[in-house]
C-alpha cells in the first residue's frame, strides 16, 4: 500500500497555562530526507492552518518565530506543543505529514486530536 499512516492521540487536555502537547507519529513508505509537518484545526467543515514546519531528517523541527507551535523530532515521531490556547480554541487538531523529498511525494493525515482548553478562574483579590 502506497499510503502513509499518521497516528496521534484522540484527546489531550491543555494545561491551565493554555499549553497542549501531543505526539504525531508517521509510518513512512519511503526514506524521506525532507519532511513537512502541519497542524490543522478543523471546525465544522472549515479547515485552517495553525502552524507548519519543514525539517531535514536528523535535524530539529523549526517553526517560524511568531508561531504558536514548537516541536522536536525523533525519527518518524514529532512531539508538538501548541501554546497560548484559550477555551475558544477547543477543537480538533489534525497532524498532517508530507514527505517532500526525495520523490515520490507522500501525504499523511491523522484522525485528529481533540484538544480541550479550560480558561483558568481569575484569582480573587486578596486583602492584606
Amino acid at each position: 500500500c502506497k499510503a502513509m499512516h499518521v497516528a496521534q492521540p484522540a484527546v489531550v487536555l491543555a494545561s491551565s497555562r493554555g499549553i497542549a502537547s501531543f505526539v504525531c507519529e508517521y509510518a513512512s513508505p519511503g526514506k524521506a530526507t525532507e519532511v513537512r509537518v502541519t497542524v490543522l484545526r478543523q471546525a465544522d467543515s472549515q479547515v485552517t492552518e495553525v502552524c507548519a514546519a519543514t525539517y531535514m531528517m536528523g535535524n530539529e523541527l523549526t517553526f517560524l518565530d511568531d508561531s504558536i507551535c514548537t516541536g522536536t523530532s525523533s525519527g518518524n515521531q514529532v512531539n508538538l506543543t501548541i501554546q497560548g490556547l484559550r477555551a475558544m480554541d477547543t477543537g480538533l487538531y489534525i497532524c498532517k505529514v508530507e514527505l517532500m523529498y526525495p520523490p515520490p511525494y507522500y501525504l499523511g493525515i491523522g484522525n485528529g486530536t481533540q484538544i480541550y482548553v479550560i480558561d483558568p478562574e481569575p484569582c480573587p483579590d486578596s486583602d492584606f
Partner: antibody, heavy 118, light 108 residues
Framework: QVQLVESGGGVVQPGRSLRLSCAAS????????MNWVRQAPGKGLEWVAV????????YYTDSVKGRFTISRDNSKNTLYLQMNSLRAEDTAVYYC???????????WGQGTLVTVSS | EIVLTQSPGTLSLSPGERATLSCRAS???????LAWYQQKPGQAPRLLIY???SRATGIPDRFSGSGSGTDFTLTISRLEPEDFAVYYC?????????FGPGTKVDIK
C-alpha cells in the same frame, strides 16, 4: 473569495515554447501547493505538475519531465508553467488548481487552451 | 503509479433516479486520499467529495461517497437536471497524482 485566472495559451508550432501563468487571489498563496492539470479535446483529466509552498519541491508526470517547468512567485501570487519542445499531444486546455489543506484540488481556474500545430 | 479505473463509462438515467459510479484502484489507496470531481461541458472540474466520503463546501447531500482499499463509490441519490455531467475520481496520497478516465452520466 478564491480566484485563479490562467493566461498565456494560444497556437504554437511543434518544438516551440510557451509560458502559461495563473494569477491567484483571495488566499495566502504561499501556504498552498499548486498544480497544473490538462485536458486534451474530448478526453479526461491528466495531472501535469505540482509545486509546493516555497517552490523548491516540484513533481511532474513522466510525459512532460525535462520539457516542462513549474514555478511560482509568491510575492506576485502567480503560478507558471514553462513548456518547451512542445508536441501535438500537448494540445489541451490547461487548468491551474489549488491543493486543499487536506489534499484534494479544491479550486480550479477556467483553463487556457494550448494548441500545438504546424 | 496508481491506476484508477472507472465504470461504467457511460450511465444513462432519468432525473429522479439513483446513480452509482464506481472507481477501482490498481493498488490500495487510503480512503483519506480519494476524491471525486464533477465536470460539465466547457467548465472546469468541481470538487465534490474528498477523503472518500467528506462533502466539499456547498455540495448538496444527495452526493455521497464511500469505499476503502481499492474500491470506491460515488452515489447520487436522486438525479437533478444539473447533475448530468462527467465524474472523475482521483487519488492524491502520493505522486504522481492520478485521475480515473471518467464516467459520463447522461439523460436517458
Amino acid at each position: 473569495q478564491v480566484q485563479l485566472v490562467e493566461s498565456g495559451g494560444g497556437v504554437v508550432q511543434p518544438g516551440r515554447s510557451l509560458r502559461l501563468s495563473c494569477a491567484a487571489s483571495g488566499f495566502t498563496f504561499s501556504s498552498y501547493g499548486m498544480n497544473w492539470v490538462r485536458q486534451a479535446p474530448g478526453k479526461g483529466l491528466e495531472w501535469v505538475a505540482v509545486i509546493w509552498y516555497g517552490g523548491s519541491n516540484k513533481y511532474y508526470t513522466d510525459s512532460v519531465k525535462g520539457r516542462f517547468t513549474i514555478s511560482r512567485d509568491n510575492s506576485k501570487n502567480t503560478l507558471y508553467l514553462q513548456m518547451n519542445s512542445l508536441r501535438a499531444e500537448d494540445t489541451a486546455v490547461y487548468y491551474c488548481a489549488r491543493v486543499h489543506l487536506l489534499g484534494p484540488f479544491d479550486y480550479w481556474g477556467q483553463g487556457t487552451l494550448v494548441t500545438v500545430s504546424s | 503509479e496508481i491506476v484508477l479505473t472507472q465504470s461504467p463509462g457511460t450511465l444513462s438515467l432519468s432525473p429522479g433516479e439513483r446513480a452509482t459510479l464506481s472507481c477501482r484502484a490498481s493498488q490500495s489507496v487510503s480512503s483519506s486520499y480519494l476524491a471525486w470531481y464533477q465536470q460539465k461541458p466547457g467548465q472546469a472540474p468541481r470538487l465534490l467529495i474528498y477523503g472518500a466520503s467528506s462533502r466539499a463546501t456547498g455540495i448538496p447531500d444527495r452526493f455521497s461517497g464511500s469505499g476503502s482499499g481499492t474500491d470506491f463509490t460515488l452515489t447520487i441519490s436522486r438525479l437533478e437536471p444539473e447533475d448530468f455531467a462527467v465524474y472523475y475520481c482521483q487519488q492524491y496520497g502520493s505522486s504522481p497524482f492520478t485521475f480515473g478516465p471518467g464516467t459520463k452520466v447522461d439523460i436517458k
